[in-house]
Interface confidence: low
């Protein structure tokens, strides 16, 4: 599924991530404009053998298990399949865990290079919240 | 339960492709790897690549790049994979397997056969 | 590539035998080395995963062992529905490679 800007705010707000750690809802969509576009089946193999999953491309190698990334931790404990529904309750869910990891955001390069210190709530303009 | 039936056996000649099907059943096509795997009389089981019926993406082995490319479509739950540019060394038998990083589901294979 | 040389490539036995099949690895791949059965004319069918993870269905004759690059799969007392080629795979990193195979054969 391939959300739009304002569908993916109200799904996320409706899964609590508004403010979640101190983050705001536009970090949140900002983040999955620059790692999925948007996009819940996006998938992108890194150098070392694992893959990023889903709107927010969560890493094989710490935080899911695909049964293909060697030293896998999933200490999300999920199936990486799960992070590719276009019900995002596992992605969200598995972002908590993240988020509080002790990085914050800056687990997202995407966040880091394309949002973090920009005008973050313009993600969430205008829509009906 | 998890099935994936194969095309049936091909004959064909030297230079032309051919396009071998694999439609899966008993689960959600989308959320798994989609493996190719070729063999052939003495030379064992050989990687050909796989893709991510859901998203498209796909990764080849080095050595079937230009030979071989994928192609999924989740509205029939079918994976394809095309063979181009056919040659005697191309006669194998082809598997689909589900993608596990092992692979405990396989299609019953496609013999290709390349002949002038 | 990762480089899996399996020995014997052939093991003639007599039903009720115990039998080793040896699968080493050029380089270490953890436990990430799997094995298939597959008799003529037939798909290769998944034994062990993870190096000593039976799977489900798959008699209790048959276990895995080994960790970085040297794996063995034993059949404790072989049945003559156990003779056919037998492949260990890796899948610790990419291209997926696979064992030349041992074939098992009666004596």
């Known amino acids: 599924k391939v959300f739009g800007r304002c569908e993916l705010a109200a799904a996320m707000k409706r899964h609590g991530l508004d403010n979640y750690r101190g983050y705001s809802l536009g970090n949140w969509v900002c983040a999955a404009k620059f790692e999925s576009n948007f996009n819940t089946q996006a998938t992108n193999r890194n150098t070392d053998g694992s893959t990023d999953y889903g709107i927010l491309q969560i890493n094989s190698r710490w935080w899911c298990n695909d049964g293909r990334t060697p030293g896998s931790r999933n200490l999300c404990n999920i199936p990486c399949s799960a992070l590719l529904s276009s019900d995002i309750t596992a992605s969200v869910n598995c972002a908590k865990k993240i988020v509080s990891d002790g990085n914050g955001m800056n687990a997202w390069v995407a966040w880091r290079n394309r949002c973090k210190g920009t005008d973050v709530q313009a993600w969430i303009r205008g829509c009906r919240l | 339960q998890v099935q994936l039936q194969e095309s049936g056996a091909e004959v064909m000649k030297p230079g032309a492709s051919v396009k071998i099907s694999c439609k899966a059943t008993g689960y959600t096509f989308t959320t798994y790897w989609i493996e190719w795997v070729k063999q052939r009389p003495g030379h064992g089981l050989e990687w050909i690549g796989e893709?991510?019926?859901?998203?498209?993406?796909?990764y080849y082995n080095e050595k079937f790049k230009g030979k071989a490319t994928f192609t999924a479509d989740t509205s029939s739950n079918t994976a394809y994979m095309q063979l181009s540019s056919l040659t005697s060394e191309d006669s194998a038998v082809y598997y689909c397997?589900?993608?596990?990083?092992?692979?405990?589901?396989w299609g019953q294979g496609t013999t290709l056969t390349v002949s002038s | 590539d990762i480089e899996l040389t399996q020995s014997p490539a052939t093991l003639s036995v007599t039903p009720g035998d115990s039998v080793s099949l040896s699968c080493r690895a050029s380089?270490?791949?953890?436990?990430?080395l799997h094995w298939y059965q597959q008799k003529p004319h037939e798909s290769p069918r998944l034994l062990i995963k993870?190096?000593?993870q039976r799977v489900s269905g798959i008699p209790s004759r048959f276990s895995g062992s080994g960790s970085g690059t040297d794996f063995t799969l034993s059949i404790n007392s072989v049945e003559t529905e156990d003779f056919g080629m037998y492949f260990c795979q890796q899948s610790n990193s990419w291209p997926r490679t696979f064992g030349g195979g041992t074939k098992l054969e009666i004596k």
């Open positions: 397997a589900r993608g596990d990083g092992h692979y405990c589901y």
């Open positions: 380089q270490s791949i953890s436990n990430n």
């Open positions: 893709i991510l019926p859901g998203s498209g993406s796909t």
């Open positions: 993870y190096a000593s």
